[in-house]
C-alpha cells in the first residue's frame, strides 16, 4: 500500500467549522477536493463466489475488510472491476458472470457465454469487466461475486483481476 | 434523480465577473472545479436502433432529451456505455455493434461476433462496452445506436445497460 | 491536438515557492488541481507488436514519443486502452492479447479466445479493453503490446483503437 503523502488526502483535511479565519491554506484545504481511491488485485486462493482481494494494493480513503471495500467518505464513486477467465471447456457452453454488489445488493452484472460450440477445447480465455457510477455513503460496502470463480485465472494472471473505485465528486 | 446539494455543482457557481472582492468562499466557488455527470439506464421498451434511456437516473449538469444526453457545460468529458446482450442464436453468426454518437456523428464503435459456431443454441450472453474521451461544447448531444437492439436484454437485466458521462476538465 | 486554454493546465501553474502573498488567484493556481490527459488513436499502418499512435490526438501534460506516452507530472493515473479486432478465422482458435506496459514492464494484460469452433468463417469481430490505475513518475513510459497486431482493424475502424490516460490525483 502506498503511504506517500498526497495533497488533499482525506486524512489531512480539517473538519469544516473549525476556526480558519484568514488562513488561506486552511481555507483551500476545506474546499471540497477530497480524493479517495482503491485498486486491489484478486487474492491468490479463491474458495467462494464472493471474491477476496489482496489488501496490500492501493488504498486511499477506502478500507478493505473481508472481501469488501468500505467507503469512508460519501460521494459519487466510479467503480470498475475487471476479471480474466481461463475456461477448460466442457462439452457444453459456459456462462461467465460478474456481479457488482453494493451493501450486498446486486447493482450491476455482466454475462458472457463461452465454449458455445460445445467442443471440448484445451482452453478459452475471456475477459469481463463491469463499471458502476453511484452515490455511496460512509460504511457502504462494495464487493464482487462470481458464480464460476474456479475459472478466474489466479495462478498465471492474478494481477489481471482487479477491483477499483475512485471518488468523482464528494458530497460533504 | 439525486437532488442532494453537492459542492461545486454547476448550478451554484456564480458567473465569472461578478463582484467577489475578498469573499474567499465566493472566490473558491469561482475556481474551475465544476463537475457534471450522468448515469442513465436503458428504457424498458426499445423499438428503434437509437437507444432511449430512463430519465430518472443520475443527472447533474447534463440534460436528457429524446434519447440524447445534452451537455450544459463545455469541457473534456469521459463517456462510457455498456450493454448486455442476450442472443437467441440463429444458424449463422451475429455481429453486435454499439455506436457512440456525438451530434449524430459516429465517434466510436465496438463490434463483437457471437454465435460463431453457426449452431442454434438456447442463448448466448455478450457484454459490450465503449468509451470515449472528447471535448464537448454546450448543447452537444451524446447518443447510442445499436443495430441489433432486439438483442439488448431489457427484461432480465435492465440495469446492466447504461450510458454515463462525466466532466474531467472544464474549459471555462 | 487541442490547444484550447484550459484552466489549471500544467503549463500555467506558477512554480511553488514563488512570491504570491495575498494574490488569491495566484494562491488558487498553486493549489494541486493540475490535470493531465491523453487520448490517442492507433496509427494507420502497424508493423510490429508494440503499437504506434497518431500523435495528432488529444495530448495535455503528456508527451508522445516512439509509441510511448511519456508522463510529465507525477501522480495517480487512470490508463485505459481499447482495441477492435477483426479476425479472418483460420482452422484453429486464436488468442487475442492486449498488454499495458509501464517502463517496458507488463503491468496488466487481457486475453480473449476467438474462432473457438475451429471453423473457417469469413470474419469474427472482437473488442478488447484493459485499464490500470497506477502511480506514475515523471518520464514514465506507457505503451501497448499486441501479439496479433495484424488483426487490429485499422482500415475499417481506425478510430476504435485508442490509448487514453488521465491524472486522477497529483502527488506534488
Amino acid at each position: 500500500q502506498r503511504t506517500d503523502s498526497i495533497p488533499n488526502s482525506p486524512d489531512n483535511i480539517p473538519l469544516r467549522g473549525g476556526n480558519c479565519s484568514e488562513d488561506l491554506l486552511c481555507i483551500l484545504k476545506r474546499a471540497p477536493f477530497k480524493k479517495s481511491w482503491a485498486y486491489l488485485q484478486v487474492a491468490k486462493h479463491l474458495n467462494k463466489t464472493k471474491l477476496s482481494w489482496n489488501k496490500d494494493g492501493i488504498l486511499h480513503g477506502v478500507r478493505y475488510q473481508d472481501g469488501n471495500l468500505v467507503i469512508q467518505f460519501p460521494g459519487l464513486y466510479f467503480i470498475i472491476c475487471q476479471l480474466q477467465f481461463l475456461v477448460q471447456c466442457p462439452n457444453n457452453s459456459v456462462d461467465l458472470k460478474l456481479e457488482l454488489l453494493i451493501n450486498k445488493h446486486i447493482k450491476k452484472q455482466a454475462l458472457v457465454t463461452v465454449c458455445e460450440s460445445g467442443m471440448q477445447t484445451k482452453h478459452v480465455y475471456q475477459n469481463l469487466s463491469q463499471f458502476l457510477l453511484d452515490y455511496l455513503q460512509v460504511n457502504t460496502t462494495v464487493s464482487v461475486n462470481v458464480d464460476t470463480f474456479q475459472y478466474i485465472d489466479t495462478s498465471t494472471f492474478p494481477l489481471e483481476n482487479v477491483l477499483s473505485v475512485f471518488l468523482y465528486s464528494n458530497s460533504d | 434523480q439525486r437532488t442532494d446539494s453537492i459542492p461545486n455543482s454547476p448550478d451554484n457557481i456564480p458567473l465569472r465577473g461578478g463582484n467577489c472582492s475578498e469573499d474567499l468562499l465566493c472566490i473558491l466557488k469561482r475556481a474551475p472545479f465544476k463537475k457534471s455527470w450522468a448515469y442513465l439506464q436503458v428504457a424498458k421498451h426499445l423499438n428503434k436502433t437509437k437507444l432511449s434511456w430512463n430519465k430518472d437516473g443520475i443527472l447533474h449538469g447534463v440534460r436528457y432529451q429524446d434519447g440524447n444526453l445534452v451537455i450544459q457545460f463545455p469541457g473534456l468529458y469521459f463517456i462510457i456505455c455498456q450493454l448486455q446482450f442476450l442472443v437467441q442464436c440463429p444458424n449463422n453468426s451475429v455481429d453486435l455493434k454499439l455506436e457512440l454518437l456525438i451530434n449524430k456523428h459516429i465517434k466510436k464503435q465496438a463490434l463483437v461476433t457471437v454465435c460463431e459456431s453457426g449452431m442454434q443454441t438456447k442463448h448466448v450472453y455478450q457484454n459490450l462496452s465503449q468509451f470515449l474521451l472528447d471535448y464537448l461544447q454546450v448543447n452537444t448531444t451524446v447518443s447510442v445506436n445499436v443495430d441489433t437492439f432486439q438483442y439488448i436484454d431489457t427484461s432480465t437485466f435492465p440495469l446492466e445497460n447504461v450510458l454515463s458521462v462525466f466532466l474531467y476538465s472544464n474549459s471555462d | 491536438q487541442r490547444t484550447d486554454s484550459i484552466p489549471n493546465s500544467p503549463d500555467n501553474i506558477p512554480l511553488r515557492g514563488g512570491n504570491c502573498s495575498e494574490d488569491l488567484l495566484c494562491i488558487l493556481k498553486r493549489a494541486p488541481f493540475k490535470k493531465s490527459w491523453a487520448y490517442l488513436q492507433v496509427a494507420k499502418h502497424l508493423n510490429k507488436t508494440k503499437l504506434s499512435w497518431n500523435k495528432d490526438g488529444i495530448l495535455h501534460g503528456v508527451r508522445y514519443q516512439d509509441g510511448n506516452l511519456v508522463i510529465q507530472f507525477p501522480g495517480l493515473y487512470f490508463i485505459i486502452c481499447q482495441l477492435q479486432f477483426l479476425v479472418q478465422c483460420p482452422n484453429n482458435s486464436v488468442d487475442l492479447k492486449l498488454e499495458l506496459l509501464i517502463n517496458k514492464h507488463i503491468k496488466k494484460q487481457a486475453l480473449v479466445t476467438v474462432c473457438e469452433s475451429g471453423m473457417q468463417t469469413k470474419h469474427v469481430y472482437q473488442n478488447l479493453s484493459q485499464f490500470l490505475l497506477d502511480y506514475l513518475q515523471v518520464n514514465t513510459t506507457v505503451s501497448v503490446n499486441v501479439d496479433t497486431f495484424q488483426y487490429i482493424d485499422t482500415s475499417t475502424f481506425p478510430l476504435e483503437n485508442v490509448l487514453s490516460v488521465f491524472l486522477y490525483s497529483n502527488s506534488d
Epitope: Q41, K44, N54, D56, G57, L86, Q88, K122, H123, D153, T154, S155, T156, F157, P158, L159 | - | K48, T49, K50, K97, L101, N103, K104, H105, I106, K107, N145, V146, D147
Partner: antibody, heavy 124, light 110 residues
C-alpha cells in the same frame, strides 16, 4: 530451497512420444510457472514451453504442434510430452522455474532454478 | 521465433573487462525489460546471473552487470577470473509470451 529433478526414459524410438516428469521439492508448484528447455550436444539452449497450475500453457512455435505440458499439484510435479520424435529431438532436457508474481507486479526472472538435466536419445 | 544473436566467442585476460552483446528485435529485447543472462559450465545446468536486464540474483558477483539499448542487450564481466570461463546465453521474453535464447557465447580466459 526449491529443487527440481527430471525423470523419464533415456531412450525413445523415432515416431514415438517422449515423456518426462519434473518433481518440485522444497516449495509449492502452485506459486510459479514452469518451463522445459533442451540442449542438443554441443549446441545452444532451446526453450520448449511453459505450464502452470491454471492450465495456461505457452509453447515454442516451432514445437507447438507436438508438445503437451501439464501440472499435477497433488504430486508437486509437471510433465512434458513431445510426440512424433525424430533424431533431431536428441538432447539434454532441463526443467526450470519460470516467472514469479509478487508485490503487485510480474517478475520475469527468466529461469532462476534448474534441474540437473536428463539426457534423452531418439534412436531405433 | 528467431534466436537472439550473440558472438560465438570472446576472450580476455584475467583482470580485464569483456562485454558480450545480444541482439534481438522490437518484439523481444526492444519491447520488454525482460532480458536474462545465464552462465553454463561444461556438463552443468545453466545458472541465472542477470535478470530483467540489469538485476543480479543474490549470490552472484557484482563483477557481472547488464545493460540494454534499443534491440540490443549486453553483459559485462569486469575483473575477469579463470572461473568465469564458460558459455553465456542471453534470453528475452517475447510478445508471444514465450522465451527465446541466444545462440551462446564461449568465453575464454587467456
Amino acid at each position: 530451497q526449491v529443487q527440481l529433478q527430471e525423470s523419464g526414459p533415456g531412450l525413445v524410438k523415432p515416431s514415438e512420444t517422449l515423456s518426462l516428469t519434473c518433481t518440485v521439492s522444497g516449495g509449492s508448484i502452485s506459486s510459479y510457472s514452469w518451463s522445459w528447455i533442451r540442449q542438443p550436444a554441443g549446441k545452444g539452449l532451446e526453450w520448449i514451453g511453459r505450464t502452470s497450475t491454471s492450465g495456461r500453457n505457452n509453447y515454442n512455435p516451432s514445437l507447438k504442434s507436438r508438445v503437451t505440458m501439464s501440472v499435477d499439484t497433488s504430486k508437486n510435479q509437471f510433465s512434458l510430452k513431445l510426440n512424433s520424435v525424430t533424431a533431431a529431438d536428441t538432447a539434454v532436457y532441463y526443467c526450470a522455474r519460470d516467472f514469479t508474481i509478487a508485490a503487485r507486479r510480474y517478475y520475469y526472472y527468466g529461469m532462476d532454478v534448474w534441474g540437473q538435466g536428463t539426457t534423452v536419445t531418439v534412436s531405433s | 521465433q528467431s534466436a537472439l544473436t550473440q558472438p560465438a566467442s570472446v576472450s580476455g585476460s584475467p583482470g580485464q573487462s569483456i562485454t558480450i552483446s545480444c541482439t534481438g528485435t522490437s518484439s523481444d529485447i526492444g519491447l520488454y525489460n525482460y532480458v536474462s543472462w545465464y552462465q553454463q559450465h561444461p556438463g552443468k545446468a545453466p545458472k541465472l546471473i542477470i535478470y530483467e536486464v540489469i538485476n543480479r540474483p543474490s549470490g552472484v558477483s557484482n563483477r557481472f552487470s547488464g545493460s540494454e539499448s534499443g534491440n540490443t542487450a549486453s553483459l559485462t564481466i569486469s575483473g575477469l577470473q579463470a572461473e568465469d570461463e564458460a558459455n553465456y546465453y542471453c534470453s528475452s521474453y517475447t510478445s508471444s509470451s514465450t522465451w527465446v535464447f541466444g545462440g551462446g557465447t564461449k568465453l575464454t580466459v587467456l
